[in-house]
């Protein structure tokens, strides 16, 4: 998270970190109680490596009461999702069990009116991505309150021109971004989960390049059908 | 305590500009939305715009577009908020708010400023 | 733009009584609303936000509810501070446009 701040301890308690042998490669959202929702290109960068998801955490590094690393049992890719466009860029990975719900790890209710955002609203993204252009990882999780932008702004040819489709929804990039390591993270707005970070190789805090986000009303025939 | 300190009121001729000041203190100035809202007597408020200090982003009414300027200070965690073009329809008490988070992802106006009276007469 | 209908425009009530004030989006604003309090030449105050969540230090006799375009602003057992007026407030898109106001007299 670019132009962000620490967030509050524990007070995102769906938020997951995807990782690969150890490491936090993507951000995730619990939204079931064995299912965290995340971007399909996580995967492309997982190769071979063991994938697990952390819950419960707000410090990568530090042990917390709260913490518990889940095992995989199935990653579910959006079927049309490919690796050379960030088109339909979600992941349900199923848990090898039930996660433990407390304070600090409880599901988010996740949008399912397919509508837009308004544009202006302001969504909160979340994420253990790194924090500058040098590439400075986290330790701890960091979040930003970001304005929606309309998808006509996003797509002018000067943005993004033409690519977000109406599946995909944007927020203003203007030195406060999400960036690499906060893909699959959630964008929340008023308490429900709105949009997924997609995970393309974008510019990071350019205010010329929005933050992309795969809206998940749009998916919500496809998650409730891995989910059932 | 968080505040939010205005400056006072002023009295201007139409035509001209005023530019009114909003002083934060106890938190984190870079970390917080600042909005701007118009009062005429006996009416209900309207929300101007706010900017965000950290980034000096904008995002104003349409409304206000042309009338209001937003600006930051960081250095003296200040905002402005200059009007321009001033009629007697300006004439009102203008407020500065912070947005304040609760949770994740829920906010709202939560420390105003005492109010700056602007008075167009000629 | 949204707009926000609040009513009614003044309410006459007595000390101990109970009260509710409405506020009607001319669209869906999916819960993004608070509610202010405004005494004579002073500042608006923060009573509720997110429609229906009370900050720290709002008694617990203010209460929000409602959902879609209608919401209320319930007062239990009015006590005389809380007399004054009352705005609505959305966040759903912008402009975020308050309602015109609700004005609590003492009878």
């Known amino acids: 998270i670019l132009g962000g701040r620490e967030a509050e301890a524990h007070a995102r308690p769906y938020m997951a970190s995807v990782q690969v042998n150890g490491e936090h490669l993507c951000g995730g959202v619990l939204v079931a109680e064995q299912w965290v929702l995340s971007a399909a290109h996580c995967l492309e960068d997982a190769a071979d490596g063991k994938v697990q998801v952390l819950l419960g955490a707000h410090s990568l590094s530090q042990p917390e009461p709260s913490k518990r690393l889940y095992d995989v049992l199935r990653a579910v890719p959006h079927p049309d999702s490919r690796p050379d466009t960030i088109d339909h860029d979600l992941l349900l990975l199923q848990l090898s069990e039930k996660a433990t719900l407390g304070p600090a790890v409880r599901p988010l209710p996740w949008q399912r009116v397919d509508r837009d955002v308004e544009p202006g609203t302001l969504c909160d993204v979340a994420g253990w991505g790194i924090v500058s252009h040098a590439g400075r990882r986290p330790d701890r999780l960091q979040h930003v309150l970001l304005p929606v932008l309309d998808r006509a702004t996003c797509n002018r040819r000067t943005h993004h021109d033409g690519a977000i489709t109406q599946r995909m929804m944007c927020a203003e990039s203007n030195r406060r971004d999400s960036c690499k390591g906060d893909s699959g993270g959630p964008l929340v707005c008023g308490g429900v989960l709105e949009g997924v970070v997609t995970s393309g190789s974008r510019v990071c805090g350019n205010r010329k390049k929005p933050g992309i986000y795969t809206r998940v009303a749009s998916y919500a025939a496809w998650i409730d059908s891995v989910l059932a | 305590q968080v505040q939010l300190q205005q400056s006072g009121p002023e009295l201007v001729k139409p035509g001209a500009s005023v530019k009114i000041s909003c002083k934060a203190s106890?938190?984190?100035?870079?970390?917080?939305?600042i909005n701007w809202v118009k009062q005429r007597p006996g009416q209900g408020p309207e929300w101007i715009g706010w900017?965000?200090?950290?980034?000096?982003?904008?995002y104003s009414n349409e409304k206000f577009e042309v009338k209001a300027t937003l600006t930051v200070d960081e250095s003296s965690s200040t905002a402005y908020m200059l009007l321009s073009s001033l009629t007697s329809e300006d004439s009102a008490v203008y407020f500065c708010?912070?947005?304040?988070?609760?949770?994740?992802?829920?906010?709202?106006?939560?420390?105003w400023g005492q109010g700056t009276s602007v008075t167009v007469s000629s | 733009d949204i707009q926000m209908t609040q009513s009614p425009a003044s309410l006459s009530v007595s000390v101990g009584e109970t009260v509710t004030i409405t506020c009607r989006a001319s669209?869906?604003?999916?819960?993004?609303l608070a509610w202010f309090q405004q005494k004579q030449g002073k500042s608006p105050r923060l009573l509720v936000y997110?429609?229906?969540n009370l900050p720290d230090g709002v008694p617990s006799r203010f209460s929000g509810s409602g959902s879609g375009t209608q919401y209320s602003l319930k007062i239990n057992i009015l006590q005389s501070e809380d007399f004054g007026s009352y705005y609505c407030?959305?966040?759903?898109?912008?402009?975020?446009?308050f309602g015109g106001g609700t004005k609590l007299e003492i009878k």
């Open positions: 708010a912070r947005l304040g988070y609760f949770g994740s992802s829920y906010h709202a106006l939560d420390y």
């Open positions: 106890a938190y984190t100035f870079t970390d917080y939305y």
């Open positions: 900017i965000f200090p950290g980034s000096n982003s904008t």
């Open positions: 669209e869906n604003i999916y819960s993004h």
């Open positions: 997110s429609a229906t």
């Open positions: 407030q959305h966040f759903w898109g912008t402009p975020w446009t």
